[in-house]
């Protein structure tokens, strides 16, 4: 998994990387495999009814550094992990949803500093 503080631009790969894809496959993908010049990813997020949905696929090199950083988004529970070490490496990624915070399901008082 890429570290949150990592800020170096991703280095171009010399060769294509194949990833497993699920809910995120290009139209022409064969056997649920996609190809990329960047990263494989697996992501877990809550759908509108609060159920966890796992998505996996390919991220292009362009912009993937930001996408793989897994910056927390307010009021959205999701987690993403990225890898490049071998083909279909994202089969072995198992991101977990961040824990619920009280304010996610109770509208408590608003505190101002």
């Amino acid at each position: 998994k890429k570290e949150d503080g990592e800020s170096t631009a991703p280095t171009p790969r010399p060769k294509v990387l194949r990833c497993k894809c699920h809910h995120h496959c290009p139209e022409d993908s064969v056997n649920n495999i996609c190809s990329t010049d960047g990263y494989c990813f697996t992501m877990i997020e809550e759908d509108d009814s609060g159920l966890p949905v796992v998505t996996s696929g390919c991220l292009g090199l362009e912009g993937s550094d930001f996408q793989c950083r897994d910056t927390p988004i307010p009021h959205q529970r999701r987690s993403i992990e990225c890898c490049t070490e071998r083909n279909e490496c994202n089969k072995d990624l198992h991101p977990t949803l961040p824990p619920l915070k009280n304010r996610d399901f109770v509208d408590g008082p608003i505190h101002h500093r």
Epitope: K15, V16, R18, D28, I33, S35, D37, E62
Partner: antibody, heavy 116, light 112 residues
Framework: QVQLQQPGAEVVRPGASLKLSCKAS????????MQWIKQRPGQGLEWIGE????????MYNQKFKGKATLTVDTSSSTAYMQLSSLTSEDSAVYFC?????????WGQGTTLTVSS | DVVMTQTPLSLPVSLGDQASISCRSS???????????LHWYLQKPGQSPNLLIY???NRFSGVPDRFSGSGSGTDFTLKISRVEAEDLGVYFC?????????FGSGTKLEIK
Amino acid sequence: QVQLQQPGAEVVRPGASLKLSCKASGYTFTSYWMQWIKQRPGQGLEWIGEIDPSDNYTMYNQKFKGKATLTVDTSSSTAYMQLSSLTSEDSAVYFCARFGFYVDYWGQGTTLTVSS
Amino acid sequence: DVVMTQTPLSLPVSLGDQASISCRSSQSLVHSTGNTYLHWYLQKPGQSPNLLIYKVSNRFSGVPDRFSGSGSGTDFTLKISRVEAEDLGVYFCSQSTHVPFTFGSGTKLEIK
């Protein structure tokens, strides 16, 4: 410089199997895929499949599944393609080729003749 | 499979002339990464193909600047500005966007 060495010619009987070799030099073998391509006169070029020597991951053209099996020996930087149940339709020139996002270097090709 | 249609099949030229070869694909070659993996090769008699142009318009190392590639989506062109004797042979376009990778049927460049 990048070199992919293949035997010049092979002659085999129908029904036999054959393992073609491709010895790579001049680059880090595991840093690129190795592809195999078939060329028959008047039939153009056909992509058979590819193997990533870093993890032995293979992808095949559906048309050649069951006909071709790709392997590598990283200790000798050699790629292999086993062809089974050979018929006259398999008589062709077979190229190995280095692939990153496109083929940039080709072997000289092995001419396979299947004949009784 | 993506069908690559090359025209013309044969291209007779005089040395010093400009030559133009067309390659059309049956579907877009724009990859999900934004790259277009369309390439051009020259195969001389009795030899293996040599890479000329990769990703539509990038000349491979050592390829003279009289070779240029252009196009987008499904429509691509290889141009040779001034044909020299060493340019004669069969030109192939190839795509590595979609599996299985496919090739054009070839254009034979020959002397008029």
